[in-house]
């Protein structure tokens, strides 16, 4: 019985729960998901019983080994998986626990602009990056391109201060989660500062 294994999968994808055993006579292998039985295998009997019929097409055993592959992942497959290997040659079952996190592939992040001020030829505002569907575990970074050195900024909010007459700048929000990343449409400082002069709470995609 080893430490808990953390696994990551993406919606629609597949994940393999690794399992090895050198036990000669395995009587049964029982997989459970959040305490609900998932699959029972009797290697000697040659039988594999998937508790819920709808999971049958999603369950596989790569190369005929003990590892369990779960396909067509859904968000609600996230949770705790537990396997027990039962054998008359073992005093107690050999066990392993896994935690699976299933993430969605990120759509294009949306950018909104906060209140803007134009003072002394300087345009000052905040750009906020967010996911429309409230996806979990998203990390945001901003790329600012166009000045002598390209800059990066961590976090969903990017404070902007751009002087009229300076070379134009391009801002791009990058949204990342453990399985994917996506980019906002590029935003030009000149356009942003022009278009926002008369609409202080505008938003852009």
């Amino acid at each position: 019985s080893g430490p808990v294994k953390e696994l990551v999968g993406s919606v629609g994808g597949a994940v393999t729960f690794p399992l090895k055993s050198k036990v000669k006579q395995v009587d049964s292998i029982v997989w459970t998901f959040n305490t609900t039985p998932l699959v029972t295998i009797q290697p000697e009997g040659g039988t594999i019983i998937v508790t819920q019929n709808r999971n049958r097409e999603r369950v596989d055993f790569p190369d005929g080994g003990y590892s369990l592959k779960l396909s067509k992942l859904k968000k609600n497959d996230s949770g705790i998986y537990y396997v027990g290997i039962y054998s008359s040659s073992l005093q107690q079952p050999s066990t392993q626990e896994y935690v699976l996190h299933v993430y969605e592939h990120l759509s294009k992040p949306k950018v909104t602009m906060g209140l803007q001020s134009n003072k002394n030829g300087t345009c000052v505002t905040n750009l906020t990056c967010c996911m429309e569907h409230g996806e979990e575990d998203v990390i945001y970074t901003w790329k600012a391109l166009g000045q002598a050195a390209n800059e990066s900024h961590n976090g969903s909010i990017l404070p902007i201060s751009w002087r009229w007459g300076e070379s134009d700048m391009t801002f791009i929000c990058v949204a990342r989660n453990p399985v994917s990343r996506n980019f906002s449409s590029p935003i030009l400082a000149r356009k942003l500062c022009e278009g926002a002069a008369d609409d202080p709470d505008s938003s852009m995609v």
Epitope: S21, K22, K24, I41, P43, E44, G45, G46, T47, I48, R56, F61, D63, G64, G65, Y66
Partner: antibody
Framework: QVQLVQSGAEVKKPGASVKVSCKAS????????MNWVRQAPGQCLEWIGR????????KYNAKFKGKATLTADKSTSTAYMELSSLRSEDTAVYYC?????????????WGQGTLVTVSS | DIQMTQSPSSLSASVGDRVTITCKAS??????VAWYQQKPGKAPKLLIY???YRYTGVPDRFTGSGSGTDFTLTISSLQPEDFATYYC??????????FGCGTKVEIK
């Protein structure tokens, strides 16, 4: 990758013995069952028996008890099948085949086969 | 010993055809049936185990089904490389494991 390589064809006289070898590579030889299967000309496939190299435990089809002896050498990852008191009806291709872990009676990797011809 | 009766013993089909091979066990073997493909001069190749589990790398046009005593191997759309002999095998509990006598799939 998993490979099972068997010894070459043999021609034997009735009453003689023959020992066929099967060298395994690419997996944990000691902890997988190794099966032996016979295919005689125009006959169905027949399961002879299997051996667990880890402890040399062998199980036989009753039909082949006394005819076949299965052994394994862990140090060279080689399984052997010896056939004794050969008769013309023992003429066949003999295969070694590894058991899958998840269903030990299903065989996923096979040797290329060894033709044993028994003829006077 | 458990007998495995396979039918038909041979069949002729064309590329693209749907082909069904059946296997009947002489007693209940639960879902412990494997299917193999064999080409002349070659060793058998595992296609399906535990009645319906496709072995890694086997194309999804091969489907196994059944439980108890009646089992089926279906090839949904026959490809040129599928012309071969197919064997069922029961791998239920205590050996001996037994095979059907094969179905030869030939070109029509």
């Amino acid at each position: 990758q998993v490979q099972l390589v068997q010894s070459g064809a043999e021609v034997k006289k009735p009453g003689a013995s023959v020992k066929v070898s099967c060298k395994a590579s690419g997996y944990a030889f000691s902890s997988s069952w190794m099966n032996w299967v016979r295919q005689a000309p125009g006959q169905c496939l027949e399961w002879i028996g299997r051996i667990y190299p880890g402890d040399a435990d062998a199980k036989y089809n009753a039909k082949f008890k006394g005819k076949a002896t299965l052994t394994a050498d862990k140090s060279t990852s080689t399984a052997y099948m010896e056939l004794s008191s050969l008769r013309s009806e023992d003429t066949a291709v003999y295969y070694c085949a590894r058991s899958t872990m998840i269903a030990t009676g299903a065989m996923d990797y096979w040797g290329q086969g060894t033709l044993v011809t028994v003829s006077s | 010993d458990i007998q495995m009766t396979q039918s038909p013993s041979s069949l002729s089909a064309s590329v693209g055809d749907r082909v069904t091979i059946t296997c009947k066990a002489s007693q209940d073997v639960s879902t412990a049936v494997a299917w193999y493909q064999q080409k002349p001069g070659k060793a058998p190749k595992l296609l399906i185990y535990s009645a319906s589990y496709r072995y890694t790398g086997v194309p999804d046009r091969f489907t196994g089904s059944g439980s108890g005593t009646d089992f089926t191997l279906t090839i949904s759309s026959l490809q040129p490389e599928d012309f071969a002999t197919y064997y069922c095998q029961q791998h239920y509990s205590t050996p001996p494991y037994t095979f059907g006598c094969g179905t030869k799939v030939e070109i029509k």
